[in-house]
């Protein structure tokens, strides 16, 4: 029991999750492309989810998508419309901790 406790505590010691940079608010123009960046790091590597106005983001082929990056995740919206205005939040978890950041797309 003692050795297994030591192993798990070592694992806990190596586990971390950090929001490296808060998300910026973005003001842009109709028809343009906007990119929102979720900059997080962690161990185990975090899972990142995107929300708009407190609801899971709906991906739209060739227009709205998100993908993993070396720094976390990037959400890209092409051909911006007024309907895209709102709060965009990324939520990252490594299974133990959760961090989030919110930006506004004006």
């Amino acid at each position: 029991p003692t050795s297994s406790w030591n192993i798990s505590s070592e694992l806990n010691k190596d586990s971390y999750l950090t929001l490296d940079e808060p998300m910026n608010n973005i003001t842009t123009s109709l028809g343009q492309t906007a990119e929102l960046h979720c900059k997080v790091s962690g161990n185990p590597p975090p899972t990142i989810r995107w929300f708009k106005n407190d609801a899971p983001v709906v991906q739209e082929p060739r227009r709205l998508s998100f993908r993993s990056t070396i720094y976390g995740s990037r959400l890209r919206i092409r051909n911006l419309d007024t309907t895209d205005t709102g709060y965009f939040q990324c939520v990252a978890t490594n299974g133990k901790e959760v961090v989030s950041s919110t930006g506004v797309l004006f």
């Epitope: 608010n25 003001t27 708009k52 106005n53 407190d54 609801a55 899971p56 983001v57 709906v58 007024t82 309907t83 895209d84 205005t85 709102g86 709060y87 939040q89 919110t102 506004v104 004006f106």
Partner: antibody, heavy 119, light 107 residues
Framework: EVQLVESGGGLVQPGGSLRLSCAAS????????IHWVRQAPGKGLEWVAY????????YYADSVKGRFTISADTSKNTAYLQMNSLRAEDTAVYYC????????????WGQGTLVTVSS | DIQMTQSPSSLSASVGDRVTITCRAS??????VAWYQQKPGKAPKLLIY???SLYSGVPSRFSGSRSGTDFTLTISSLQPEDFATYYC?????????FGQGTKVEIK
């Protein structure tokens, strides 16, 4: 206690102007979006305009664009709706409401103020 | 704009009845749907947000659910104070759009 209190409604002739006020209290005004929603007599709810009080960004429904202007004075915790070139179809109860940071669900509403456009 | 088609437009029910009101979005609005109750001469009140989250202070007989683009408000056991008009609202896309309302009347 959270309160939103509208004022400034009344009877106005077609083509006339009115300015509605929405006085907020009981919460930190500049971390909310303030909305104006209207309801014509016996009809449903229609979004009119909103303003991010912390960023100044505004949105207008097509039906009022170019005629109505929404603004906010964070020092007075008050939002305004300037209504110009009023039409009979603008007759409605006008409500101000707020949505918390992160969502557009409207969690508090004022009691409403009636605007009647008639000759 | 996104259309929110609400049904029925009115219904008659008795105290104690289970009441279901539905809204269908014209395209996906994720879970960004709220439900409001409005009584005559009064402002709307928020009941449900994020499709299924009960707003603070709202009785637990109210519940919301989602299946794709279909959203449902359920009142498990209708009380005398529940006779009112109910509206759904999507707020995923700007501008948020409301359903046309459902009036719940006494049978």
């Amino acid at each position: 206690e959270v309160q939103l209190v509208e004022s400034g409604g009344g009877l106005v002739q077609p083509g006339g102007s009115l300015r509605l006020s929405c006085a907020a209290s009981g919460f930190t005004f500049d971390s909310y979006v303030i909305h104006w929603v209207r309801q014509a007599p016996g009809k449903g709810l229609e979004w009119v305009a909103y303003i991010f009080s912390f960023g100044g960004y505004t949105y207008y429904a097509d039906s009022v664009k170019g005629r109505f202007t929404i603004s906010a004075d964070t020092s007075k915790n008050t939002a305004y709706l300037q209504m110009n070139s009023l039409r009979a179809e603008d007759t409605a109860v006008y409500y101000c409401a707020r949505s918390p940071y992160g969502t557009f669900a409207l969690d508090y509403w004022g009691q409403g103020t009636l605007v009647t456009v008639s000759s | 704009d996104i259309q929110m088609t609400q049904s029925p437009s009115s219904l008659s029910a008795s105290v104690g009845d289970r009441v279901t009101i539905t809204c269908r979005a014209s395209q996906s609005v994720s879970s960004a749907v709220a439900w409001y109750q409005q009584k005559p001469g009064k402002a709307p009140k928020l009941l449900i947000y994020s499709a299924s989250s009960l707003y603070s202070g709202v009785p637990s007989r109210f519940s919301g659910s989602r299946s794709g683009t279909d959203f449902t408000l359920t009142i498990s056991s209708l009380q005398p104070e529940d006779f009112a008009t109910y509206y759904c609202q999507q707020y995923y896309y700007t501008p948020g759009t409301f359903g046309q309302g459902t009036k719940v009347e006494i049978k």
